[in-house]
């Protein structure tokens, strides 16, 4: 029952003498396992015996007998699904039909496989895409209908006999569907590959040549052009003739149109391979190329730069940069269309030739105001000298120059005067637009560049002004030299360094902080009385009577200034002590009597001591000694002693008389 046996394998396998053949094969016997397998070469059915005749390459039977060929032929299958075979080595006479005779318990089957063994290794086959175009990546495929595990091979790509640099990807297939070895090469052909010979070479594992396939590449490309010019250097003078020729070195497919371009723009009515330019003008200078098109696209030649030579045209001057700032650098460029380029230049400043300046550029590293003006130039080449153009104006900008602060007042200036100053300058570019003054004050600026100081202060020493355009220039400060009466007059004690004691030598100094003018006179006064005209007031031996309020005056030509009143204090021991009695020196007993110790002292008496007629000190220490009630026994002479920080003083005796009251007398 044929439906029970299903086989899958390549229809035909290819190999060559000495190689091997690997036959991938699968089968399905539905009625049970395989019991017997015979591999025939060119089997023929014998009707008489009802068996197949032919060379038995391999036999697998129940009794296990196998022919000697089995070393070369191997059945790599199994009893139910795999029928893979290997013949190694394979020989030329193995060509033909292989018959796989399969038997199970109840069924038999003969499966036929074609084997094509050539005498020599057959060539691979190169497959090309239908069209190859320059710079477009293509894949070249080299296919060989052979692959066998026991016989490794390799496929190598050659271009004009040289191995190709691009990496090829080789793949093999040993399946029931197909057996092959394939190499794929990706590359981007250039126009120069057109007509070149590409070879796929079959080699054995050692790199030995076995066979090859060859193709000549047909690379479609835009026309490749060469441009030739007469004269060859493409340098001519106005009025000369020029011939340009366009040569097509390669075009695939054939070219269809020709055109010429100048500076990228197509020239009208120029559609031949030769471009004739008669009596050229300088306007015809430029970059020329020819363009030839085919079905792939346009091809362009390299550009030829046609130079039509002429004498320099009137020149113009370019200034980098105007206006220029004083001290900066400036470059002047002489621009003149000329061919060849000018070799010599003449420069003019305000119409006068600038000596030693013959270059296209003039560089002034440090610009000064006098560099301002008109600059012009003349260019010269081998064909002649150009004309001087209109020139260019250099504006040199600088801060105001020679700025001075000027006092407008008659001198000298006195404190309290109104002072007017002006800010003057010599030159400025651009014009002065504002002024600044130092130091700042609440001053009037009645007009630009004028400063009015009302009621000028004694301490307004210097004033400076700045004239400003884009920059400010400061004048040197000017001294106002304000004159004023002496200031800060005060009395200062020079000696003694401590307090003044009666009898000390004393010096007082009349001080002042400043005076303008410096020449001064001094006056000392006490209580409106002039004491002296020196800066110092001296006392050889001071007495308490010298104490009081002192003032000094300092005057100069502007005026006089008095000090604050200064109090001179003289310290002395208690003096002029006396005991006064109240209500009198005669008091009736029983009444009250008060004795007071009066004194003159500086500082005042701080401690009093009372003595009786026996010089006996009494237990009283205040200024007043109060006796109440007074007794007759209190009668007698009393004296007191006063003490301060300077010393002691004593009073003379004062007698107190206490007389009896009428009552006492009445009792007696």
């Amino acid at each position: 029952d044929s439906s029970k046996w299903v086989f899958e394998h390549p229809e035909t396998l290819y190999a060559w003498e000495g190689a091997c053949v690997w036959i991938p094969c699968t089968y399905r016997a539905l009625d049970g396992d395989l019991e017997s397998f015979i591999l025939f070469h060119n089997p023929e059915y014998n009707k008489n015996t009802s068996k197949f005749d032919g060379t038995r390459l391999y036999e697998s039977t129940k009794d296990g007998k196998v022919p000697s060929e089995q070393k070369r032929v191997q059945f790599l299958g199994d009893k139910n699904k795999n029928c893979t075979l290997s013949i190694h080595p394979v020989h030329l006479n193995d060509s033909g039909q292989l018959g796989l005779r399969m038997e199970s318990k109840t069924e038999k089957w003969m499966e036929r496989i074609h084997l094509n063994v050539s005498e020599r290794p057959f060539p691979p086959h190169i497959q090309l895409p239908p069209e190859i175009q320059e710079s477009q990546e293509v894949t070249l495929t080299c296919l060989l209908n052979f692959s066998c595990y026991g016989y490794p091979i390799q496929l190598q790509w050659l271009l004009e006999g040289v191995p190709m640099r691009q990496a090829a990807v080789t793949s093999t297939s040993l399946t029931i569907k197909s057996v092959f070895t394939r190499s794929e090469l990706k590359f981007s052909p250039q126009w120069s590959h057109h007509g070149k010979i590409v070879t796929c070479q079959l080699q054995d594992a050692d790199g030995k040549f076995l066979s090859n396939d060859t193709v000549q590449l047909n690379v479609k490309h835009t026309p490749k052009l060469e441009i030739k010019v007469t004269p060859s250097d493409a340098i001519v003078r106005e009025g000369d003739s020029v011939t340009m020729t366009c040569e097509v070195s390669s075009s695939n497919p054939e070219y269809t149109t020709v055109s010429w371009l100048k500076d990228g723009t197509s020239l009208k009515k120029q559609n031949t391979f030769t471009l004739n330019l008669r009596e050229v003008t300088k306007d015809q200078s430029g970059k020329y190329c020819c363009q030839v098109s085919n079905d792939v696209g346009p091809g362009r030649s390299e550009e030829v730069f046609l130079q039509v030579q002429y004498a320099p045209e009137p020149s113009t001057v370019q200034i980098l940069h105007s206006p220029a700032v004083e001290g900066s650098q400036v470059e002047f460029l002489c621009m003149s269309l000329a061919n060849p380029l000018p070799t010599n230049y003449t420069w003019y400043h305000n119409g006068k030739e600038m000596q030693g300046r013959t270059e296209e550029k003039v560089h002034i590293p440090k610009i000064l105001p006098w560099h301002a003006g008109t600059y012009s130039c003349v260019a010269e080449n081998i064909l002649g000298t150009g004309q001087r153009g209109p020139g260019a104006e250099l504006d040199v900008q600088y801060p105001p120059k020679k700025v001075t602060t000027v006092i407008q007042n008659p001198m000298p200036i006195r404190e309290g005067d109104t002072v007017t100053l002006s800010c003057n300058y010599n030159s400025s570019n651009p014009s002065v637009t504002r002024y600044e003054w130092k130091p700042h004050g609440a001053w009037e600026e009645p007009s630009l560049g004028v400063l009015k100081i009302q009621n000028v202060g004694w301490d307004n020493t210097t004033i400076a002004c700045a004239a400003c355009n884009s920059w400010c220039s400061w004048a040197s400060p000017v001294a106002l030299n304000v004159q004023y009466a002496p200031r800060d007059v005060r009395v200062r004690k020079i000696k003694p360094l401590s307090e003044i004691h009666s009898g000390n030598s004393v010096s007082l100094q009349c001080d002042f902080s400043s005076s303008h003018p410096k020449e001064v006179q001094f006056f000392w006064e006490k209580n409106g009385r002039l004491l002296g005209k020196e800066s110092q007031l001296n006392f050889d031996s001071i007495s308490p009577e010298d104490a009081g309020s002192y003032s000094c005056w300092v005057n100069n030509s502007i005026g006089q200034t008095a000090s604050k009143a200064w109090t001179l204090e003289v310290l002395y021991a208690p003096r002029r002590l006396r005991v006064s009695m109240s209500p009198g020196d005669q008091v009736m007993e029983g009444k009250s009597a008060t004795l007071t110790c009066e004194s003159d002292a500086n500082p005042p008496v701080s401690h009093y001591t009372w003595f009786d007629w026996n010089n006996q000190s009494l237990p009283y220490h205040s200024q007043k000694l109060r006796l109440e009630p007074v007794k007759v026994q209190h009668s007698g002479a009393y004296w007191c002693q006063g003490t301060n920080s300077v010393g002691k003083g004593r009073s003379p005796l004062s007698t107190l008389t206490v007389y009896y009251s009428p009552e006492t007398i009445g009792r007696r």
């Epitope: 271009l159 004009e160 006999g161 590959h193 010979i197 070879t199 000549q216 390669s250």
Partner: antibody, heavy 116, light 112 residues
Framework: QVQLVQSGAEVKKPGASVKVSCKAS????????LHWVRQAPGQRLEWIGY????????EYNQNFKDRVTITADTSASTAYMELSSLRSEDTAVYYC?????????WGQGTTLTVSS | DIVLTQSPDSLAVSAGERVTMNCKSS????????????LAWYQQKPGQPPKLLIY???TRESGVPDRFSGSGSGTDFTLTISSVQAEDVAIYYC????????FGGGTKLEIK
Amino acid sequence: QVQLVQSGAEVKKPGASVKVSCKASGYTFTSYWLHWVRQAPGQRLEWIGYINPRNDYTEYNQNFKDRVTITADTSASTAYMELSSLRSEDTAVYYCARRDITTFYWGQGTTLTVSS
Amino acid sequence: DIVLTQSPDSLAVSAGERVTMNCKSSQSVLYSANHKNYLAWYQQKPGQPPKLLIYWASTRESGVPDRFSGSGSGTDFTLTISSVQAEDVAIYYCHQYLSSWTFGGGTKLEIK
């Protein structure tokens, strides 16, 4: 070995056409381009064009492109060059040739005489 | 097309003499992929097809006597016969095959 064998000499009248054959052997015919070159008496060799037998692609010298047709029969490994509107200046020896990487193979030449 | 200009047109030398002939190309025939110059030299005798002497500008074809040598690169090429023999009388052509094919006008060699 590689051989290119050309058809015999031809005598033609002006205005007529001629078809010269070139049979290739000893190599795979479709692997290489086949060129045609002619040489007029006492003149330089002049390239006419080529055919790529693999895909019948042709390329011609601009001087001939309106009058020449190159064809190939791969089954017979033979290339043909047909020249029409013959004139006396077409009198020349016509060669087929092919290049290999390191050599050139030439046919023996076919003499064409154009005479009234 | 690439134009090949040969010089001189003809020359006559005595047997045994050294001879050089030139071929100038209007464009370079150097192929960058393999750094070979695609220029060949042929010898052609009357009634015969051209015979290849030199390919790749300087490689001698097998069987060609070593008195023949080629040199040059890019656009300027020379064929030298170191010692001219009587059988060398022929016309010598240069041939570029980088792009299409073009041939030089030939140099005719004669023996005095």
